[in-house]
Structures are given as structure tokens and as C-alpha cells.
């Protein structure tokens, strides 16, 4: 038998036991509520600031590209990978066919206002995909040149020039005067290289990376 | 509805069940209680037994440091 | 920790504290049925009035369409 | 070798033009490079005026505004700078140089005409 | 325009020693790897004569002793170790953006 306790003391007691399960209750709430609002809130600002670094991203671009086509890169919708919108995009770049007639240092700088370089060809599938897009009746100023007429070319974004992925017509390079490449085409040999004078002006292409965001 | 969407709903539902839950429990707890207190003033403390099962419970819910 | 990754977690954690809680809910609602069965068979019904509110949070948690 | 020599008259008056000559030698005019006149002042402080290419196309520094041009004729191997409305400031020894396409460096020089401008 | 200031006006070096050029640009005359800037050496009665392109490439026929670095704006010209016949005036000329533009000129003398 549990001796008799005084009705004041079991209502003491009682008020005691209420206050702490309503403040387990509050506690455990509490802590409840804590883990909701980091669910909602830590997203929530993790969106806002991503979304914030891409306005700002945005922002960079937007003074030479106005309007960006994005698409979704993978099933992350974090991803989206955007090119400006009158250019083309293929594999992890942006080409952009210039139809106005320039030096070869002007065309370069040209591009480089627009945050990219005169274009540089690293593949043959990649020529394949500019070549679709040029006229045949021109031709267009590549980001290859030979500063010091020497045969020593290089690319304009410092990539190594590799004679084994090199697609010149047949017969050129074949001027050490003429120091700048360009594409062309020829109806025996199709598209391909070939060098001449800097400053005759031609049309051009530029690539850029592609503007991830 | 996207996968993210999906897991703040799911979010949302379990953070009101959770709610709901503790302060019925906290209610059932405190039932408990006054009918173990009532049953003492009735029946000189049949209810002996629910009284320490009460107490099982609580200790279950109760966090006490281990013994250094 | 990614966006999508820390929902997951918390859902867990929502989750789980649902879970015990419901067992020890479901334990004390068990505990106290019990309580009031014995105490009809040892004094007649004292705790009528434990049972009736017994049955009160009982029906928070029924769900019955309402009427048509 | 390509050689380069200038010829002109060696004092104008103000507000008169000055004209020069350059003849090449070694090297055809119309075959590759930029063909510059350069010139420098008393002080030694050196001005690029512009250049005629191979191709006949040209180039002026904007600071001579339209006083200033540039000719050629491929038959003799010359080409021509005529500067108008010249003062004491057009004073100078004036050179003719080739000039690499690209990244157009100044690669040979003529030995240069000293030209004074005074009444 | 692109402005090119060259320091020090003048400098004086002894025979043996290094001599060090140095050219600034108002803005940056470098594309990528291409630093168009030029040095060209002028004595006296005589044509300047180019000595260096493309900031660091030796033009044909002109000594090892001479060497260029530098990129975007600033330029230096190396010419170690100074000889007798190396008494003379110095340019650096831009060619990135027209109108080409000359520095205004660095006098060695040999002591």
C-alpha cells in the first residue's frame, strides 16, 4: 500500500507532472519546429542564393548577351547549360558565325568583347558540326595564327597545336608571310585551311564556353 | 510534382503529425495522471500498478545523463 | 550537404520521432484500457470517468466521414 | 635585301603640303606587308602616320584626321605619303618602314628624310 | 589611344652588366598569349632597328644577350651582359589596337 498522501501534496504533485510533460511537449515542438524550418528555410535560402549567383551570373553576360538559350544539363534541375541566343551550341561550347568583314586581330578582339575567342578546332567532329553552318562562298578567320612567320602556330586560348589534328587543304600552310588561318571551301578537297594575310578582312567564328548556371 | 516539391509536402505532413501526436500524448500522459491521483482518493490506490507503469513510461521519455 | 539531400534527412528524422511516438502513445492508450478493465473488476467502475474520456482522444483520432 | 629610301624636299612652308617618296628595292610593293610611314620628332619621340598593305587597302592614325593619305604605284615600286596644311609641328624626320602583317612589328626601316617646316 | 611609358628615361650600365627596360601600357596590349608589344633599338643618325616581337620572340640576327618578358600591361626588355655597341635608344611599340603607338624611349649609356 502506498501510504496516504495529502490532497494538497497530490495536487502539488500533479502540477508538477502536468509542467513537465507540457514542457517535454514544448521542447519536443520545439525541436519539431527547428527541424521543419531547416527542411523549408535552409532550402529555401539555398534556392535564393543559387538563384542569386545566377541572376548575378546572368548579370556578367548580360551586357554582351542579352538573352541566353538554356537547356537542362542531366535530370539535376540545378543544372542548365546556356549559350547566347543567336549562337549554336555543341558538345560544351557556343559558336557564333560573324558575317562582318574584318581583320584577323580586329575579328579576335571582336570575339573577346563578346567573352569568347576566334574559334579553335580541336576534333574533326567539331569542324563537322561548323562547317554546317558556313557558306561556301566565304571564308571565316580561325583563332590560329603564326605571329613570328616561323611555322610556329598557335591557338589563341593557348591550346597546343597538334599537327595530327590539323586539317589544312592540300599544299598549305605554304606562306610564311601570311600568318593567319582561316576555313574554307574548295570543291576538290571541301572544307578545310588555309593560311593567309592578317589583315585582308574576312568573316570569322567565335566559340565561347558554354555559360553554366 | 518534382522530387524536391515532393519531399517539403511529405516534410510538412510528418512535422504536423509529429505536433498532433505529442500533444495528444502529452494529453493521454496527464489523463493518466489525475486518474491515478482520483483513483488514490477513491479506492485507497487500487491502481498501484498503472501508478508504476505510469512511471515506466515516463522513464522512457525522461533523459538522464549515464553515470560517470 | 545539397538541398534535396538535407530534406531527406529531416524527413527520416520526422519520421522516426512520428514512429516512437506513436508506439508510445499507442502503449500508454494500451496501458491505460488495461488500467480501466481491472479497475471495473476490483470496485465496479470507479474509473467511468477515466474510461469516458479514454474514449474522448479516441475519437480525435477516429476519422469518420461527415455526415452527407 | 629589301632596302627602303625616302626622297622629298627637305624644308616646306606652313600650310603647304609635303610630299614623299618612298622606293623599294628587293621586294615587290604589292607581294606582302604593310608599307608605313613613320615619323619622328625632334626629341625623338616616334609617330606611326599609317601604312598602305599590299592589297592597296590602308590604314591612318585618326590624329592626322583627313590631312593625311597614302598612296602607291606598283609599276615603280613606290608608294607616296602627301601630308596637307603642314606646321612647325609637322617638323620631323620622316621614315618609310615595312611592317610585318601580323602582329604587324615595324621589320625594316628606310634611313629616314629630315623635313622642316618654316616660312 | 594606348599609351606606352617607358622607365627610366635614361640609365646608365656597366660593360658586363644587366640592363633593364621597362614599358608600361595604359591598357592591356596582350591577347592570350600574344603580347603585342615590339622593342626596336635606334643610335644615333641611324633608322630604328627591331630587336624583339611579340614581347619575347627575337627577331633574326639579333644577339641572345637581348630577351623580352612581360604580358597584359607591363613589359621589361633584358639585355644581358651589356656590350660596348649596345649604347642606344630603345622603343617598345604596341600593335593591339589602332593607332600603333611607341613608348618614348629609354637612353642607355655603357660606363
Known amino acids: 500500500m502506498v501510504p496516504e498522501e495529502e490532497p494538497q501534496d497530490r495536487e502539488k504533485g500533479l502540477w508538477w507532472f502536468q509542467l513537465k510533460v507540457w514542457s517535454m511537449a514544448v521542447v519536443s515542438i520545439l525541436l519539431l519546429s527547428v527541424c521543419f524550418t531547416v527542411s523549408s528555410v535552409v532550402p529555401h535560402n539555398f534556392m535564393y542564393s543559387k538563384t542569386v549567383k545566377r541572376l548575378s551570373k546572368l548579370r556578367e553576360y548580360q551586357q554582351y548577351h542579352p538573352s541566353l538559350t538554356c537547356v537542362m544539363e542531366g535530370k539535376d534541375i540545378e543544372d542548365w547549360s546556356c549559350c547566347p541566343t543567336p549562337w549554336t551550341s555543341f558538345q560544351s561550347s557556343c559558336y557564333f558565325i560573324s558575317t562582318g568583314m574584318q581583320s584577323w586581330t580586329k575579328s579576335q578582339k571582336n570575339c573577346s568583347v563578346m567573352g569568347a575567342d576566334l574559334v579553335v578546332i580541336n576534333t574533326r567532329e567539331e569542324q563537322d558540326f561548323i562547317i554546317q553552318n558556313l557558306k561556301r562562298n566565304s571564308s571565316y578567320f580561325l583563332g590560329l595564327s603564326d605571329p613570328g612567320g616561323r611555322r610556329h602556330w598557335q591557338w589563341v586560348d593557348q591550346t597546343p597545336y597538334n599537327e595530327n589534328v590539323t586539317f589544312w587543304h592540300s599544299g598549305e600552310p605554304n606562306n610564311l608571310d601570311e600568318r593567319c588561318a582561316i576555313i574554307n571551301f574548295r570543291s576538290s578537297e571541301e572544307w578545310g585551311w588555309n593560311d593567309i594575310h592578317c589583315h585582308v578582312p574576312q568573316k570569322s567564328i567565335c566559340k565561347m564556353k558554354k555559360i553554366y548556371i | 510534382l518534382g522530387e524536391p516539391q515532393l519531399c517539403y509536402i511529405l516534410d510538412a505532413i510528418l512535422f504536423l503529425y509529429g505536433i498532433v501526436l505529442t500533444l495528444l500524448y502529452c494529453r493521454l500522459k496527464i489523463q493518466v495522471r489525475k486518474a491515478a491521483i482520483t483513483s488514490y482518493e477513491k479506492s485507497d490506490g487500487v491502481y498501484t500498478g498503472l501508478s508504476t507503469r505510469n512511471q515506466e513510461t515516463y522513464e522512457t521519455l525522461k533523459h538522464e545523463k549515464p553515470p560517470q | 550537404l545539397g538541398e534535396p539531400q538535407l530534406c531527406y534527412i529531416l524527413d527520416a528524422i520526422l519520421f522516426l520521432y512520428g514512429i516512437v511516438l506513436t508506439l508510445l502513445y499507442c502503449r500508454l492508450k494500451i496501458q491505460v484500457r488495461k488500467a480501466a478493465i481491472t479497475s471495473y473488476e476490483k470496485s465496479d467502475g470507479v474509473y467511468t470517468g477515466l474510461s469516458t474520456r479514454n474514449q474522448e482522444t479516441y475519437e480525435t483520432l477516429k476519422h469518420e466521414k461527415p455526415p452527407q | 635585301d629589301v632596302q627602303l629610301q625616302e626622297s622629298g624636299p627637305g624644308l616646306v612652308k606652313p600650310s603647304q603640303s609635303l610630299s614623299l617618296t618612298c622606293s623599294v628595292t628587293?621586294?615587290?610593293?604589292?607581294?606582302?606587308?604593310?608599307w608605313n610611314w613613320i615619323r619622328q620628332f625632334p626629341g625623338n619621340k616616334l609617330e606611326w602616320m599609317g601604312y598602305?598593305?599590299?592589297?592597296?587597302?590602308?590604314n591612318y592614325n585618326p590624329s592626322l584626321k583627313d590631312r593625311f593619305s597614302i598612296t602607291r604605284d606598283t609599276s615603280k615600286n613606290q608608294f607616296f605619303l602627301k601630308l596637307n596644311s603642314v606646321t612647325t609641328e609637322d617638323t620631323a624626320t620622316y621614315y618609310c618602314?615595312?611592317?610585318?602583317?601580323?602582329?604587324?612589328?615595324?621589320?625594316?626601316w628606310g634611313q629616314g628624310t629630315s623635313v622642316t617646316v618654316s616660312s | 589611344d594606348i599609351v606606352l611609358t617607358q622607365s627610366p628615361a635614361s640609365l646608365a650600365v656597366s660593360l658586363g652588366q644587366r640592363a633593364t627596360i621597362s614599358c608600361r601600357a595604359s591598357?592591356?596590349?596582350?591577347?592570350?598569349?600574344?603580347?603585342?608589344i615590339h622593342w626596336y633599338q635606334q643610335k644615333p643618325g641611324q633608322p630604328p632597328k627591331l630587336l624583339i616581337y611579340?614581347?619575347?620572340n627575337l627577331e633574326s640576327g639579333v644577339p641572345a644577350r637581348f630577351s623580352g618578358s612581360g604580358s597584359e600591361t607591363d613589359f621589361t626588355l633584358n639585355i644581358h651582359p651589356v656590350e660596348e655597341e649596345d649604347a642606344a635608344t630603345y622603343f617598345c611599340?604596341?600593335?593591339?589596337?589602332?593607332?600603333?603607338?611607341f613608348g618614348g624611349g629609354t637612353k642607355l649609356e655603357i660606363k
Open positions: 598602305i598593305s599590299f592589297d592597296g587597302t590602308y
Open positions: 611579340v614581347a619575347s
Open positions: 618602314a615595312r611592317g610585318v602583317d601580323y602582329p604587324n612589328a615595324i621589320d625594316w
Open positions: 628587293g621586294y615587290s610593293i604589292a607581294s606582302g606587308y604593310y
Open positions: 591598357e592591356s596590349v596582350s591577347m592570350h598569349v600574344t603580347h603585342l
Open positions: 611599340q604596341q600593335s593591339f589596337e589602332d593607332p600603333w603607338t
